[in-house]
Interface confidence: low
């Protein structure tokens, strides 16, 4: 059938120490997030249909001002990538919070059934869990 | 019929005092903006078909430098939300102009026929009306 | 046939002196970039099917810190536009790197067969060629 696979997720929590991944959640009971095709595996988004996808993300840092992002030696960085299967591991999209408190971007990329996407936030600042400030989604656009 | 509803709008003007909304306009006579399905109601975008939409926006502040955005106690913030009907009022997407002069983002969200989207710009700085710097659009992507 | 035209490009190189254009490349052999419908003409993206397109871009500056973007009198600016045919020349999307090192945005715009899109980066800073930091793409979304 025509691939309508689509998902929009909201932040659930950050990972334990040494785990830079953001953990996502989705579903109408949670608000305006949803999964229609893709699925969540321990908070990470797994693709179920091959194709080219538009991947988009916005992450806003909590307790943030331009000084809090600029005064760190190691800038806070957000990377979206395929983290499994290991043979397909790759960084798809990467941004740093220089003197800002929000990053937002999007890109087209081929994804395959079974690809699990990870969103790694490195640095000491915390992401906002407000649903209009931090979200992550994919949309199948063609085979 | 298959939902191809789509719109791309350009800024018309800001609201009067105490009205933080941006007022939009669209149509080929104005340039590269258009409405095909959605409609404008007093400068606000109204949805005419249920579905999941990709909502995107870029707003650039006029007469802006990184010092003008950082020196205000009240940061300039842009929020896109459903403002009517009141029962569905919600903030969908929110960004602050910390030390920057442009925000741009996008997200997938379910919208229903009759939902009116508002774009609220709070703060004392004015948005640019250049059509390549400030624009707002929606695209129906699936039922 | 139904228009599935789509492309995602990675940066090849910057132009020679006095040429602000970025030169792009795409194809599976290069990584995750591809052209399915549109084509490249000397590193510039040419549209082959009329329609409304979602145009998106992310550009990250190399060897960049918030001070390197803020200390220039003339801010580094990225503009995406139609550069040929000359009769249709127009700026579609424009952003400045104020105190940041990455810009990312997207917009819907009508494009016609034969339109060539140029991405002009003005300023003295160089863009990163990392494929997860700098990319440019278009997606046909409706007639």
């Amino acid at each position: 059938s025509l691939g309508w696979d689509i998902a929009e997720l909201q932040l659930n929590h950050t990972g334990p120490q040494q785990d830079p991944r953001l953990y996502w959640q989705g579903g109408p009971a949670l608000g305006r997030s949803f999964l229609r095709g893709p699925e969540l595996d321990k908070g990470q988004l797994r693709i179920r249909r091959d194709g080219i996808y538009m991947v988009h993300i916005q992450v806003t840092l909590a307790i943030c001002s331009s000084t809090s992002t600029s005064r760190h030696h190691h800038p806070t960085t957000l990377a979206v990538g395929i983290c499994s299967p290991a043979s397909r591991s790759i960084s798809l999209l990467r941004l740093s919070f220089h003197q800002g408190c929000t990053i937002a971007s999007q890109r087209l990329t081929p994804l395959a059934r079974g690809d699990t996407l990870c969103t790694n936030l490195t640095g000491t600042l915390l992401p906002s869990r407000n649903t209009d400030e931090t979200f992550f989604g994919v949309q199948w656009v063609r085979p | 019929s298959l939902g191809w509803d789509i719109a791309e709008l350009q800024l018309n003007h800001t609201g009067p005092q105490q009205d933080p909304r941006l007022y939009w306009q669209g149509g080929p006579a104005l340039g590269r903006s258009f409405l095909r399905g959605p409609e404008l109601d007093k400068g606000q975008l109204r949805i005419r078909r249920d579905g999941i939409y990709m909502v995107h926006i870029q707003v650039t502040l006029a007469i802006c430098s990184s010092t003008s955005t950082s020196r205000h106690h009240h940061p300039t913030t842009l929020a896109v939300g459903i403002c009517s009907p009141a029962s569905r009022s919600i903030s969908l997407l929110r960004l602050s102009f910390h030390q920057g002069c442009t925000i741009a983002s996008q997200r997938l969200t379910p919208l229903a026929r009759g939902d009116t989207l508002c774009t609220n710009l709070t703060g004392t700085l004015l948005p640019s009306r250049n059509t390549d710097e400030t624009f707002f659009g929606v695209q129906w992507v699936r039922p | 046939s139904l228009g599935w035209d789509i492309a995602e490009l990675q940066l090849n190189h910057t132009g020679p002196q006095q040429d602000p254009r970025l030169y792009w490349q795409g194809g599976p052999a290069l990584g995750r970039s591809f052209l399915r419908g549109p084509e490249l003409d000397k590193g510039q993206l040419r549209i082959r099917r009329d329609g409304i397109y979602m145009v998106h871009i992310q550009v990250t500056l190399a060897i960049c810190s918030s001070t390197s973007t803020s200390r220039h009198h003339h801010p580094t600016t990225l503009a995406v536009g139609i550069c040929s045919p000359a009769s249709r020349s127009i700026s579609l999307l424009r952003l400045s790197f104020h105190q940041g090192c990455t810009i990312a945005s997207q917009r819907l715009t009508p494009l016609a067969r034969g339109d060539t899109l140029c991405t002009n980066l003005t300023g003295t800073l160089l863009p990163s060629r990392n494929t997860d930091e700098t990319f440019f793409g278009v997606q046909w979304v409706r007639p």
């Epitope: 334990p16 120490q17 909590a62 307790i63 | 106690h73 903030s91 709070t122 | -």
Partner: antibody, heavy 131, light 118 residues
């Protein structure tokens, strides 16, 4: 450095309305990511959250005090005010104002917040309810 | 509304470590809650110590020594405040506070009085 200072009458008669102001210096009460709370502490007892006002003026109240509590603000004075109506001797307490980090957003029937921590407190003002 | 239980009092010797608990009532999983901790000395307002949601979602108050740390004990459905290298100046009342993302009603525990012996 953010500083908060409570002010108001030390003695209020039963059935009257208690009004306390909190003046903030070193930061604006309209700054995003903060909201502004009132907390009280009866003699020899623990802390009780009464309510808060957000950076955009939204108000939140403790369910047990909701019918008697009102919080407002005057941005020109950088001040927020607590009003507690129909007071009784049980309302005798030290009243604190505090800044809270963690902006609240209301979405789809639920409140979401980034953090919830009372990071700056006033010195407190003693209020006695007695005839 | 969550009910938080703290032991009314506890005591420990200087230099030792102490663990203060903040137990949520049944039906409220500690994993879903943000917990913040406050110290109050006699005659003074409370002071913010730290906030804890998970090991990487936490925040230490300005000027608060690293001797103070937070954690959770899911088996006891409790938030924990750990104080190591106990000092005489740590003698105070300690309060926990929680709020979860389904409501906005911050609740404080009843407080624990910590006595430093000797």
């Amino acid at each position: 450095q953010v500083q908060l200072q409570e002010s108001g009458p030390g003695l209020v008669k039963p059935s009257q309305t208690l009004s306390l102001a909190c003046t903030v210096s070193g930061g604006s009460i309209t700054t995003s990511y903060y909201y502004w709370s009132w907390i009280r502490q009866p003699p020899g007892k623990g802390l009780e959250w009464m309510g808060a006002i957000g950076s955009r003026g939204s108000t939140y109240y403790s369910p047990s005090l909701k019918t008697r509590t009102s919080i407002s603000r005057d941005t020109s004075k950088n001040q927020f005010t607590l009003q507690l109506s129909s007071v009784t001797p049980e309302d005798t307490a030290v009243y604190y104002c505090a800044r809270v980090t963690g902006e609240i957003t209301y979405n789809s029937g639920s409140y979401y917040y980034t953090l919830n921590l009372f990071d700056y407190w006033g010195q407190g003002t003693q209020v006695t309810v007695s005839s | 509304q969550s009910v938080l239980t703290q032991p009314p009092s506890l005591s420990a010797s200087p230099g030792s470590s102490v663990r203060l608990t903040c137990t949520l009532s049944s039906g409220n999983s500690v994993g879903n809650y943000d917990i913040s901790w406050y110290q109050q000395k006699a005659g003074s307002p409370p002071r913010y110590l730290l906030y804890y949601y998970s090991d990487s979602y936490k925040n230490q108050g300005s000027g608060v020594p690293s001797r103070f740390s937070g954690s959770k004990d899911p088996s006891a459905n409790a938030g924990l405040l750990l104080i190591s290298g106990l000092q005489a100046e740590d003698e105070a009342d300690y309060y926990c506070s929680v709020s979860n993302s389904g409501t906005y009603k911050p609740v404080f525990g009843g407080g624990s009085k910590l006595t430093v012996l000797g």
